[in-house]
Structure formats: C-alpha cells, structure tokens
Interface confidence: low
C-alpha cells in the first residue's frame, strides 16, 4: 500500500503528460487526481511508465471506482489492462465491441490469459449470445476460441453467426462440439447451391448424420479423405460401398491408406467383401460371401 502523503508544492498534475514518468510512486499517489486520470486514460499508453508506476495508477482508479470501472475508462486502459486481475474484470460491464477489440489488441500475440478469458465471458454474457460480429472478432484474435467452448455454450450461438467461422476455427473441435454446430451451419447455408454449400459445410461435417452424408453422395461433391476421416463413425457405418464411392469421387483411392484407422476400419467390417472388391483397392476385412448379416439392434427393438 502507498502511504497518503501531501503533494509537494508545484507538483500537482494538471495533465497526464510525460513529466509524470519522473515522479516517485508516492508522488504519483499524492499528485495525480484520480478523476483526471480517468478522463485522460488514452494518454497513459503513450507514456513509458514503469510497472510500479502503473500499479499506482491502477490503485487510484480502483479507489475511484470500487464497484468496477466505467466503459469509457476500460476502453482506454491499454497496457494497464495487463495489470488487472480477473477479480477486477469480474466487476466490469463491457458492452462495446470496440472496447473488446482494444483490450484484445493489448494481449495480441500472447496466450489467452485468465484476464482475457474473464473479459470475453463478461462481454458475451452481457450480449446474451455469441453474435456474428463478436465471433468474428474473437476468432480473429484466437482461432481456437470456438472449440474451447462447451457444447452448452455453443448452443447459444445463433445460426447467423456461423458465417463468421473459418475452417481453421474448427480445427480443435471435438465431435460433441460439431454435433451442436453442424445443424446451425446447415440452417445458415441452406439457401446456397450444391457446390458452394459443400465448400461452406465441409468443415462442420464431423457433426453430420448418416442421412445428410447419403444426400451429399448424390451431389458429386468429391469429399477429400481428411474430411471423411473426421466424420462420425456412427454416421459412416450405414453407408453402402456405392455411396462412399460417390461421396469421395476420385479420392476413394485414399481408403486403402486409411483402412486400419477409424472410421474406415469400422466401415470395412460392416461391408460385404464382394462389394469392397468392386472398388479394386484391395480392401480386406469385409463380411465373407454367403454370410447372413443380422441387425441385432433391430431385433432387440422388436422383442
């Protein structure tokens, strides 16, 4: 804590200017008016204060705004933002996207800190949903942002926001997350024509059900193997050899290289060897000719 001492004669700050960098900590405490500091926060960033001096300035703002800083101050915090604790940020009410951008810019190039995490949480909660502009901003700064959200949090993303999502934003999403995002993407892109639709929906297909994959197989989409390998195993298993051949088009040759990996391995085990042989890829492990395939799950449902 900085002791309360009287400001030396002639040192009372009239402006936030570069002369303040020569002030000792106690002089900053005594000579800088907190209200002045609040109105001139934009100048603080242009002055090379030491970390210790910034601590004093933060302390002054904390005293002025014990319930949390107003947005007019928050927007101009600049590097002082790095001095804030998550506890401080939990008191804020940030509603402007410009404020959010300004603070994310300060942290640019670094891992997401709990300060930033708390800021984003406060901002999104304040808006009530993850709208397109917010998502655009967050994924620009943190490409992994979307995949860090829980399925419950993703359920608040409106379909209109899906337009802001780039393929790389989904790189680290797991199947549970894609299960939530895929129906939203399907809705968002529903009015596009076949080939354009496939380009947009491709990154989300890890959440697609069997019936949608069957429909895509009728549209000459030529899905690449990387996308196919990310599909849900339970969605791939019911596809016939002919449907997979149509779905992959010229990429069907890639199945051979992936025959030991899911979902290809499990899919092969469900196909008749006769049908697999028609692909001419030498895929092995299908159901031998003459064997009867019983769908036990169907039997159980009937009994």
């Amino acid at each position: 804590e900085v002791e309360k001492t009287a400001c030396p004669s002639g040192k009372k700050a009239r402006e936030i200017d570069e002369s303040l960098i020569f002030y000792k900590k106690w002089e900053l405490e005594a000579c800088v008016d907190a209200a002045l500091l609040a109105t001139q926060m934009d100048r603080v960033n242009a002055i090379p204060f030491t970390y210790e001096q910034l601590d004093v300035l933060k302390h002054k703002l904390d005293e002025l705004y014990p319930q949390g800083y107003p947005e007019s101050v928050i927007q101009h915090l600049g590097y002082l933002f790095l001095k804030m604790s998550p506890e401080d940020i939990r008191k804020w009410n940030v509603t402007s996207l410009e404020t959010l951008k300004a603070l994310l810019e300060v942290n640019k190039g670094h891992e997401m800190s709990p300060q930033v995490a708390t800021l984003i949480d406060r901002f999104v909660k304040g808006r009530g949903q993850l709208d397109k502009d917010t998502l655009d901003t967050l994924t620009a700064f943190y490409p992994g942002y979307l995949c860090s959200l829980s399925p419950e949090e993703l359920s608040s993303v409106p379909p209109s926001s899906i337009w802001a999502v780039r393929p790389q934003d989904l790189d680290t999403c797991d199947p549970r997350q894609l299960d939530v995002l895929y129906p939203k993407a399907r809705l968002a892109f529903q009015n596009m024509n076949g080939s354009e639709y496939f380009v947009k929906i491709q990154s989300f297909l890890g959440g697609a059900p069997t019936e949608d994959l069957k429909a895509l197989s009728q549209q000459n989409v030529s899905m690449d193997l990387a996308t196919f390998m990310k599909l849900r195993t339970d969605a791939v298993l019911p596809l016939t050899v002919a449907e997979v051949q149509k779905l992959l088009g010229p990429h069907v040759e890639g199945l051979k290289a992936e025959e030991r990996h899911r979902p290809v391995r499990d899919w092969i085990l469900r196909q008749r060897q006769d049908d697999l042989d028609t692909l001419g890829l030498g895929l092995q492990g299908g159901i031998p000719n003459g064997y009867l395939v019983l769908d036990l799950s169907m039997q159980e449902a009937l009994s």
Partner: antibody, heavy 123, light 112 residues
Amino acid sequence: QVQLKQSGPGLVQPSQSLSITCTVSGFSLFSYGVHWVRQSPGKGLEWLGVIWSGGSTDYNAAFISRLSISKDNSKSQVFFKMNSLQADDTAMYYCARNGGSMITTLYYAMDYWGQGTSVTVSS
Amino acid sequence: DVVMTQTPLSLPVSLGDQASISCRSSQSLVHSYGNTYLHWYLQKPGQSPKLLIYKVSNRFSGVPDRFSGSGSGTDFTLKISRVEAEDLGVYFCSQSTHIPFTFGGGTKLEIK
C-alpha cells in the same frame, strides 16, 4: 499433466522468514494464477494470497504486511515469502492453481495442488 | 471475512449409504453478475486437498457422478449417493466470491 512441485525448508527459527518455491509444469503461468493456502490443526485451511496470470496479486489482509508473492513466468516458478514467523505459523503450506479453462468462465477454485511444504517454527 | 460453517463435524456412514454435508456462509456468495463461487474439496489422510465440485454443482473432471452439489445464496449441500471406501476423508467447502477466499472447518466422513 498439470503438476505443482514445492521446495522449501521444513524448519524456521522464530522471527525469521519463510521462502517457498512452487515450480509448475503442464500449464503456463502466463495463463493461470497460483494461490497459496496453509493448513494447521488449530486454524484449518487459510487462504493467504494469489498471484494472477498478469502478475498482479491479492493478499489476505491478515497477512498483507508480511507476505510477498512473485513469479518468473519463463522459469515456471512462483515464489512465496512470509516474514516474521512465529510458532502459530507452524503449518502445511500449499500452492495451488487457479482453476478454469483458458477461455470459458474461470471458476476461481483451486483445481490442482502442490504436495505441500511442512513448516515448523521453532528454535 | 466470510465465515463458512460446515455441519456435521463428523459423519459416520456405512458403505453404500447416502451422505449429506451442509455448508453455510455468513453472507451471500452470489457474485455481482450472477455466478456463485462455492466449491467442495476432499482431503484424504496425508494428501493435498482435491477439487470435487466447483461453482455449487459442477463436477470437476474425473469426479464420479455419485457426488453432487446444490444450494444457493448462503446454504449449500454436498451429497454422495452411495458412499465407497475411497470417499473417506475430510470434506471442505470454500468460497471465492469475496476476498479473502475462505474455507469451512471440514467434515470428516468415516465408517460407522
């Protein structure tokens, strides 16, 4: 995996200071805060303070005059120093990570703890 | 400081029984924007505490679903639906809504 390893003396003379280092692995101090908590039979679990990822600190007012927490992000180390120890400071001292995912809501619980440093204050 | 009061001090149970521990705070733990930062920890003999439940009712990763938390405001409960031998130890509630963070005195779960 997430680990916090503590190193420090077991025996401290009365009126001397206690220094403990908490070396973390499996996560970055740029992204997570670290709390310090102590446990004694007489007083149970007591929260002493925290250093947040950005380097700012919050201390329990009862200890603020003799407690200092700092860190070196590049070495993944957090440093705890308490001055003027007396017999009633005898306790097990723990460092613990401030819990939460990097991006979604932080939950401000201590999700991973160090093994503890048993400190006896005696001459 | 916020005082956390746990009851009972000791809870003898038979394996397979349900156990219930209560925690009461001296002031509301609802944070200014709605979250309630009340957590539960288990400490086994000779070990560090381990997080079980965070923010009233969320199980930490790896915690079995026989553990559940509930409550609001100032009154909170931890329930174990079917006690197993590995659940024995001292349970602590803790709040992190207000600084300083504070802990309850602990409840020892032991075999009847």
